[in-house]
């Protein structure tokens, strides 16, 4: 559980707070809501920012919900339930004792169901695709530069290793990032691509979660990059699990924003 | 040297409120947490909740989210909490203790609710 | 919420014995335990910090051991002075919890 150490504070997340009785008398930092220690030389889990956010005083900004055909990230509006290791525990119940199963970003991917409901391992999501919309500009960006560009971003920003960008396509003005990481390919260590498009999402969004940076600021050789419709998929390693008449209508996790 | 100094023993009748202060010097009181504990009669140890005097971000226990104040006043370096619609199952010695892992402990405040 | 189990609930020993206590967490909880000595009318007192870190002025008889679920305070040579109550208390996330303690005795 590292911090700086000079005066205590966690560079990777700025829902914490820190103080000097870690082990070792070292800077420990905890996560706002679940209490638990994070490592501040990293990103912290989505889970454990996600209670964060539900812990954080009520006058933060609304969000409108997304369609209730979409399986959606509720982006916060749910206060999850994070194993140990502050990975979300497949199964999350709300004080109803309504239940649902979820993947390793959090998004539902069962019916609802009650307390008899079973999920039976936490289901990985190992590709995600960020699909963005850029503002008008004077004229399309270069593929390779703007490529070049994200892929620095996220190793550079989320310290995700770039192996698991597997590509950047354009055709202006939508922008599509694809993040892959299997369950074998995640070394101990390793950034989760679920935790970094989260970061990315709210770095996109103008709500950073980095302590003390401004926010992001993407430009592409000098040209501002201002993204004004953010669209993200996610697809598990085992595909989800709804009833037939849902499956009709729907054939990605989606997470919309405006 | 580190210290925390509790105020007095209290008397209270059932429904009535009660505050209690703990005082710290020998350190920087910004910079830790101060934890609430109370230990009833012939009982165990039980953690009420927690407060970082900086930014005054507090945490209860479920069981006294309803009823348990915690405040700080960092001019004073004191912590405060105040247990409301007191009952007899109240009565306890309440303590207050510093950092995660309670180093320092005040010497803890005999609260009687009794008609 | 993290349960802490403490076993035995009484201890029965004598002194220049060896005394060993138990902790038992709910859930994996790393090494965040912490061990306490409490006497009649005192405050507890911190004993051993993060499972094993000790702690100045606590005399070196007393260890701590464990991570993950299971957590060992040891006494290597009982003091007169050491019977008293002991306490787990773990630190992992909230809501803190204390284990129910043990009553350490002279036989």
């Known amino acids: 559980h590292t911090a700086a150490q000079d005066n205590c504070t966690c560079p990777t997340n700025k829902m914490t707070v820190c103080s000097p009785d870690g082990p070792g008398g070292r800077c420990q930092c905890r996560a706002l809501g679940s209490g638990m220690a994070v490592d501040c030389s990293t990103l912290t889990s989505k889970c454990l920012l996600l209670k964060a956010r539900m812990s954080a005083p009520k006058n933060a900004r609304t969000l409108v919900r997304p369609s209730e055909h979409a399986l959606v990230d509720n982006d916060g509006l749910y206060d999850p339930d994070c194993d140990p290791e502050g990975r979300f525990k497949a199964r999350q119940c709300n004080q109803t004792s309504v239940c649902w199963c979820v993947n390793s970003v959090g998004v539902r991917r069962t019916d609802k169901g009650d307390l008899s409901l079973r999920c039976d391992e936490l289901v990985r999501t190992h590709h995600i695709l960020i699909d963005l919309r850029h503002r008008p500009t004077a004229g399309a960006f270069n593929h390779s530069d703007l490529d070049a560009e994200l892929r620095r971003l996220f190793r550079e920003r989320y310290r995700l290793h770039p192996k698991f960008v597997a590509a950047v396509h354009y055709e202006q003005p939508t922008i599509q990032i694809e993040l892959r990481q299997n369950t074998s390919q995640k070394a101990a260590g390793d950034v989760d691509i679920g935790d970094a498009a989260y970061y990315f999402e709210r770095d996109i969004k103008g709500e950073s979660l980095f302590q003390g940076r401004g926010g992001l600021d993407l430009r592409v050789r000098g040209e501002p990059l201002q993204v004004e419709r953010t669209l993200i998929y996610y697809l598990d390693e085992i595909p989800p699990k709804f009833s037939m008449k849902r499956l009709t209508h729907h054939h990605h996790h989606h997470h919309h924003h405006h | 040297q580190v210290q925390l100094v509790q105020s007095g023993a209290e008397v209270k009748k059932p429904g009535a409120s009660v505050k209690v202060s703990c005082k710290a010097s020998g350190y920087t009181f910004t910079t830790h947490w101060i934890h609430w504990v109370r230990q009833a009669p012939g009982q165990g140890l039980e953690w009420i909740g927690t407060i970082f005097p900086s930014n005054a971000y507090a945490v209860y226990n479920q069981k006294f989210r309803d009823r348990a104040t915690m405040t700080a006043d960092r001019s004073i370096s004191t912590a405060y909490i105040e247990l409301s619609r007191l009952r007899s199952d109240d009565t306890a010695v309440y303590y207050c203790?510093?950092?995660?892992?309670?180093?320092?402990w005040g010497q803890g405040t005999t609260v009687t609710v009794s008609s | 919420e993290i349960v802490l189990t403490q076993s035995p609930a009484t201890l029965s020993l004598s002194p220049g014995e060896r005394a060993t206590l138990s902790c038992r967490a709910s859930?994996?909880?790393?090494?965040?335990i912490h061990w306490f000595q409490q006497k009649p009318g005192q405050s507890p007192r911190l004993l051993i910090k993060?499972?094993?870190e000790s702690i100045s002025g606590i005399p070196s008889r007393f260890s701590g051991s464990g991570s993950g679920t299971d957590f060992t305070l040891t006494i290597s040579s009982l003091e007169p002075e050491d019977f008293a109550v002991y306490y787990c208390q773990h630190s992992h996330s909230w809501p803190f919890t204390f284990g129910q303690g043990t009553k350490l005795e002279i036989k």
């Open positions: 859930q994996n909880i790393g090494t965040s």
């Open positions: 993060y499972a094993s």
């Open positions: 203790a510093r950092a995660s892992y309670f180093d320092y």
